[in-house]
């Protein structure tokens, strides 16, 4: 079925609400201050070979687990993450984005890299696909 | 029970190489850090380095740098400390400990009963 | 790296006394609302064990006798009575900047 409007305009926000969810959460760990980050930084993440279309989310969507245990970490009493629902909430935004009628075999990268790496990464991939929806 | 059982006293000759060992048992090993820490003789306590058991990733203190390598097995729930060089200033206690982190703490909950190592020629 | 003083460095106490014992950092242990200040408690050929972690909060199993105060720079370990089995060293650690450090003790010994 060839994108309408609306379904472009659906994606765009869900990949927009996305971006929001990785950027707040590398702006609360990614803080030479907190006194946890050395240690987060010793948790390490599995990267896509390839992250060019939607149907790459799926290696995003096998490192959600991954990712919800590191920042269970980061929380503090004026930094109120809630790792569980904000993981929740990003997977349900992904499994929309991906799709579920495909079923995609992710493939990774030899190298893994440090949660504030896979964070990047995957801003840059929503990034990616944003500019070219608009 | 939770315990992080360490291997035995030591007696090295400088320049002897040297690992040390800190069994965990009781929890899931590869889900938390392990850190270890020298006590030099009638001495207080100093941060050595950190790892994560499941990823094999390290952080050290600056001042032991080079000068000691910790690694672990996940496999067998053991961490290491080793030396490829012992030195006379490396007689000392060290502990493992296990690090908590979650919420708004970071602390040691769980430490091994020490390894003690005397370099002397 | 994070300096920790503690103080006194040694005293003598009878069991039933109220012990005191401060810890002075170099520079703030305080992020973010939360103090990263825990008390140990150290036994001559034993491995430090947990008394009291993010500076008030007591470890499960310690007695509530040990009490933890404090915030940014001051924090102040309290015991209210006393026991035998308290006579040991006690270390102050911050958890709040790497490298982690501890103070240089406080030996609690019989009067």
């Known amino acids: 079925m060839a994108p309408t409007s609306s379904s472009t305009k659906k994606t765009q926000l869900q990949l927009e609400h996305l971006l929001l969810d990785l950027q707040m959460i590398l702006n609360g760990i990614n803080n030479y201050k907190n006194p946890k980050l050395t240690r987060m930084l010793t948790f390490k993440f599995y990267m896509p070979k390839k992250a060019t279309e939607l149907k790459h989310l799926q290696c995003l969507e096998e490192e959600l687990k991954p990712l919800e245990e590191v920042l269970n970490l980061a929380q503090s009493k004026n930094f109120h993450l809630r790792p569980r629902d904000l993981i929740s909430n990003i997977n349900v935004i992904v499994l929309e984005l991906k799709g579920s009628e495909t079923t995609f075999m992710c493939e990774y990268a030899d190298e893994t890299a440090t949660i504030v790496e896979f964070l990047n990464r995957w801003i840059t991939f929503s990034q990616s696909i944003i500019s070219t929806l608009t | 029970e939770v315990q992080l059982v360490q291997s035995g006293a030591e007696v090295k000759k400088p320049g002897e190489s040297l690992k040390i060992s800190c069994k965990g048992s009781?929890?899931?090993?590869?889900?938390?850090?392990i850190e270890w820490v020298r006590q030099m003789p009638g001495k207080g306590l100093e941060w050595m380095g950190v790892?994560?058991?499941?990823?094999?990733?390290?952080y050290y203190n600056e001042k032991f740098k080079g000068q000691v390598t910790i690694s672990a097995d996940k496999s067998i729930s053991t961490a290491y400390l080793q030396w490829s060089s012992l030195k006379a200033s490396d007689t000392a206690m060290y502990y493992c400990?296990?690090?908590?982190?979650?919420?708004?703490?970071?602390?040691?909950?769980?430490w091994g009963q020490g390894t003690t190592v005397t370099v002397s020629s | 790296a994070i300096r920790l003083t503690q103080s006194p460095s040694s005293f003598s106490a009878s069991t039933g006394d109220r012990v005191t014992i401060t810890c002075k950092a170099s520079?703030?242990?305080?992020?973010?609302?939360?103090?990263?200040m825990n008390w140990y408690q150290q036994k001559p050929g034993k491995a430090p064990k947990l008394l009291i972690y993010?500076?008030?909060n007591l470890e499960s199993g310690v007695p509530s006798r040990f009490s933890g105060s404090g915030s940014g720079t001051d924090f102040t370990l309290t015991i209210s009575s006393l026991q035998s089995e308290d006579f040991a060293t006690y270390y102050c650690?911050?958890?709040?900047?790497?490298?982690?450090?501890f103070g240089g003790g406080t030996k609690v010994e019989i009067k």
């Open positions: 650690q911050q958890s709040n900047e790497d490298p982690y450090t």
């Open positions: 400990a296990r690090w908590r982190g979650e919420g708004y703490y970071a602390y040691y909950d769980v």
């Open positions: 520079q703030s242990v305080d992020y973010q609302g939360d103090s990263y």
């Open positions: 009781g929890y899931a090993f590869s889900n938390y850090l």
């Open positions: 993010s500076a008030s």
């Open positions: 790892i994560n058991p499941g990823s094999g990733g390290t």
